[in-house]
Interface confidence: low
């Protein structure tokens, strides 16, 4: 008879998951050098310990910390890329800006994008069935609490001037229950960040509005410099030209406002 | 699996396309390479294409005389060997490249049996 | 010539412990990985290590491979009349943006 297993609102574990994460570190650690010296299998089984056996509504940061010390990056300075619903730009500069860096261009960041997991209190098994939503079922399961202890670590160890891509199309540009707005923006070091320069990206092509007015922006800004941080805002009124701008700098259209 | 065919004999200034057919495996997860090994001689990388082929690298004595290429919805890589000489003369191996979408660098996991091009008058 | 430099031959009684060397630049065995592959007369190439010294599934442990600077070495502990074979390091070379191999190492078993 199969065995009772709890039944969670969220998807279930991705399919074929130690194997995407297996994979994926070995791609990791071979393009990128500073890396090579990482164990994959003992990645797997750090990150496996986190939330095997357990119950995953009752996950802690402390569980990934095995995992957070083997994946340990540094980024250089003024090199940081935040962002909040808008990832897939993010990644896409990023591509384009080689020497610029979002927590999915790391390690552990890389490893678990897009991805989901959990498992089942007492047995070894994974639960490819269902997983606990954050709003519906909890919010310290496996996923979440993966992403606040990664996201908390690569806020804290950020300098320089920290970068910040948001969505100008959404109703809170910033979003202050977003990973940005809950975690990244409150473990900045001000002894180490001198400033925080957000990026808002329009939406609509005749999108004319500062956007850096914004309300929610002007909250960011108070947030920001009582933490004795410098804030500056852009506004990227054409995400598609500012993407061929970075790819080629020398394009004399460039030379105007993007 | 790999498989090369399209090899044999042709004449100097001539040209051949070899191609290879993979299975057991994602394909468009891997960057792959041709490598040769002339008769009695060692082993030679030609050409390396990455993962969407979008990034190709050449070994300098076969650039503008060779051309790699891959169809992802085939499982197949292929190259096209222009102007050919008498040294070009060896045993073409398909391999694959470590998993990763960038290049095909650092090792081959997997090799096929190999093609023999014999470039003769 | 080849961009990795080998010893052309190396021999061991079955049994011994052989070490082929293969020495290279900054520009690949300095800042890349090295990979060991066995040939068999006849037969196309076999990964034998990658990443500086790890062993594929199925390869014996008889097989270890090193690095240091810009060399690497081969070790083949408990020689067996089967390691007889052709060996060859090989690279990637960031300044050829390519893949180099070693002109390889003839290893006879004597005896």
């Known amino acids: 008879l199969p065995r009772w297993r709890q039944q969670w609102s969220g998807s279930g574990t991705t399919s074929r998951f130690p194997e995407t994460v297996l994979a994926r570190c070995v791609k990791y650690t071979e393009v990128h050098p500073e890396m090579r010296h990482v164990d994959c299998q003992s990645v797997w089984d750090a990150f496996k310990g986190a939330f095997i056996s357990k119950y995953p509504c009752n996950i802690t940061e402390e569980d990934y910390q095995p995992l957070v010390k083997l994946g340990t990056q540094t980024v250089p300075c003024n090199k940081t890329l935040l962002w909040s619903r808008i990832k897939d730009l993010a990644h896409q500069f990023t591509q384009v800006q080689r020497d610029m860096f979002t927590l999915e261009d790391m390690l552990l960041g890389y490893l678990a994008d897009d991805l989901t997991w959990c498992g089942e209190f007492n047995t070894f098994e994974i639960n490819y069935q269902s997983c606990p939503d954050w709003r519906k079922d909890c919010s310290n399961n496996p996923v979440s609490v993966f992403w606040k202890t990664v996201s908390r670590r690569f806020a804290e160890t950020a300098c320089g001037v920290v970068h910040v891509m948001l969505n100008g199309s959404r109703s809170k540009i910033f979003d202050k229950n977003s990973t940005f707005g809950s975690v990244e923006v409150h473990n900045l070091q001000p002894e180490k960040v001198q400033a925080l320069e957000a990026w808002v990206i329009h939406g609509g092509r005749e999108d004319s509005r500062d956007l850096c007015q914004d309300p929610t922006i002007k909250e960011l800004e108070s947030i920001i410099s009582k933490r004795n941080i410098r804030f500056f805002c852009k506004n990227i009124y054409r995400p598609d030209k500012f993407l061929q701008c970075v790819k080629n700098p020398e394009d004399s259209s460039c030379l105007s406002g993007i | 699996q790999l498989l090369e065919s399209g090899g044999g004999l042709v004449q100097p200034g001539g040209s051949l396309r070899l191609s290879c057919a993979a299975s057991g495996f994602t394909f468009d997860d891997y960057g792959m390479s041709w490598v040769r090994q002339a008769p009695g001689k060692g082993l030679e990388w030609v050409s390396d294409i990455s993962w969407n082929g979008g990034k190709t690298h050449y070994v300098d004595s076969v650039k503008g005389q060779f051309t790699i290429s891959r169809d992802n919805s085939k499982n197949t890589l292929y190259l096209q060997m222009n102007s050919l000489r008498a040294e070009d003369t060896a045993v073409y191996y398909c391999?694959?490249?470590?998993?990763?979408?960038?290049?095909?660098?650092?090792?081959?996991?997997?090799w096929g049996q190999g093609t023999l091009v014999t470039v003769s008058s | 010539q080849s961009v990795l430099t080998q010893p052309p031959s190396a021999s061991g009684t079955p049994g011994q412990r052989v070490t082929i060397s293969c020495s290279g630049s900054s520009s690949n065995i300095g800042d890349n990985y090295v990979s060991w592959y066995q040939q068999l007369p006849g037969t196309a190439p076999k990964l034998l290590i990658y990443?500086?010294?790890q062993r594929p599934s199925g390869v014996p442990d008889r097989f270890s491979g090193s690095k240091s600077g810009t060399s690497a070495s081969l070790a083949i502990s408990g020689l067996r009349s089967e390691d007889e074979a052709d060996y060859y390091c090989q690279s990637y070379d960031s300044s050829l943006s390519g893949s180099v191999f070693g002109g390889g190492t003839k290893l006879t078993v004597l005896g």
């Open positions: 990443r500086d010294s």
């Open positions: 391999a694959r490249g470590s998993l990763f979408h960038d290049s095909s660098g650092f090792y081959f996991g997997h």
